[in-house]
């Protein structure tokens, strides 16, 4: 594939990555799949600067990110190491709360209204953010 050197239409470029901000809601798995079909992934937050950028664009709305612990350990969807990486949880989060009565705990992370993170039921239909890195090989064939 060819290297992607600029962002697709309707995506926002920032620090050599492209971001797409949804305006509708999906369950985490559906949001994850949507991003993958766009040759991207749910947003992976690696710095305070990136956190502020995303927060500015989403506003005070619950929004999925690419972080989950559905198989036990917290994992970023692109393989970024959770343990050593940037974290911005709300106080007392993540709490894997079972009291919602929907079954299971809370395995998927989202930005809350103040930008800090919370874990929630993955089936909730929240907005989401896709991210793809510039300079990575695109799946599309090169233009001749």
């Amino acid at each position: 594939g060819s290297e992607r050197t600029c962002c697709p239409v309707n995506w926002v470029e920032h620090e050599r990555s492209c971001y797409w901000f949804s305006r509708s809601g999906k369950a985490w798995a559906d949001a994850d799949n949507y991003c993958r079909l766009e040759d991207a992934h749910l947003v992976v937050v690696t710095s305070w600067e990136e956190q502020k950028f995303v927060q500015h664009h989403i506003g005070p709305v619950n929004t999925w990110m690419g972080l989950h612990d559905q198989n036990g350990p917290w994992k970023w969807v692109d393989g970024t190491d959770y343990e050593t990486g940037f974290k911005n949880w709300r106080p007392e989060q993540p709490d894997d709360w079972y009291g919602h009565g929907l079954g299971g705990g809370e395995d998927c992370a989202h930005f809350t209204d103040d930008g800090r993170w919370n874990d929630d039921v993955c089936q909730r239909p929240y907005r989401w953010v896709c991210e793809t890195e510039l300079d990575k090989a695109s799946q599309e064939p090169p233009l001749l």
Epitope: N71, E83, K87, D95, G103
Partner: antibody, heavy 113, light 107 residues
């Protein structure tokens, strides 16, 4: 590498007390719910208690409610189980577990006169 | 409380066999089910989560299926290291509950 190391087990008389500890390393302890699960000799697994990352959600099995207290110290990466009014039927290997995916090797509690 | 009924309680099989273990919940637990393997003197090890997803590092010979109340664990091409006790566990709601276990023994 994730490690959970239980300690504090031993032989105690009925009605006695023990405090189990679990030392965690290799992961961000304050991001995880922790559980105690026990296994009586030659028997199956029985969940005992659970505590959320910041200790704000705690649950117990009916069989230990009012006698056992779960707690954690995130600054020390440690999980605890205070066991009071012990009974013969509490005799078991007690495992500390991170959520549902990773378990320690257990510490043996024997309650006998 | 949700009861988990596992069957059979034990089974005898030969190397190369394909074995199936079942687990039934007393009420709907969606897919909040884990399968564990336990070898003598060792801690349980998770094999399958959300009823059918393979835990990382676990060989694909292990597979899980089911939703709601009925679940199965299948082990294909049984090898000597697979002879162990297997447990299901629901994590739909507290109290968390386990099946009684299935001991897979060499015929």
């Amino acid at each position: 590498e994730v490690q959970l190391v239980e300690s504090g087990g031993g032989l105690v008389k009925p009605g006695g007390s023990l405090r189990l500890s679990c030392a965690a390393s290799g992961f961000t302890f304050n991001s995880y719910r922790m559980n105690w699960v026990r296994q009586a000799p030659g028997k199956g697994l029985e969940w005992v208690s659970s505590i959320s990352s910041s200790s704000n959600h705690i649950d117990y099995a009916d069989s230990v409610k009012g006698r056992f207290t779960i707690s954690r110290d995130n600054a020390k990466n440690s999980l605890y189980l205070q066991m009071n009014s012990l009974r013969a039927e509490d005799t078991a290997l007690y495992y500390c577990a991170r959520g549902t995916d990773y378990w320690g090797q257990g510490t043996l509690v024997s309650v006998s006169s | 409380d949700i009861q988990m009924t596992q069957s059979p309680s034990s089974l005898f099989a030969s190397v190369g066999d394909r074995v199936t273990i079942t687990c039934r919940a007393s009420q709907d637990i969606s897919n909040y089910l884990i399968w564990f393997q336990q070898k003598p003197g060792k801690a349980p090890k998770s094999l399958i989560y959300t009823a059918s997803s393979l835990q990382s590092g676990v060989p694909s010979k292990f597979s899980g299926s089911g939703f709601g109340t009925d679940f199965t664990l299948t082990i294909s091409n049984l090898q000597p290291e697979d002879f162990a006790t297997y447990y299901c566990q629901q994590y739909h709601s507290f109290p968390l509950t386990f099946g009684g276990g299935t001991r897979v023994e060499i015929r």
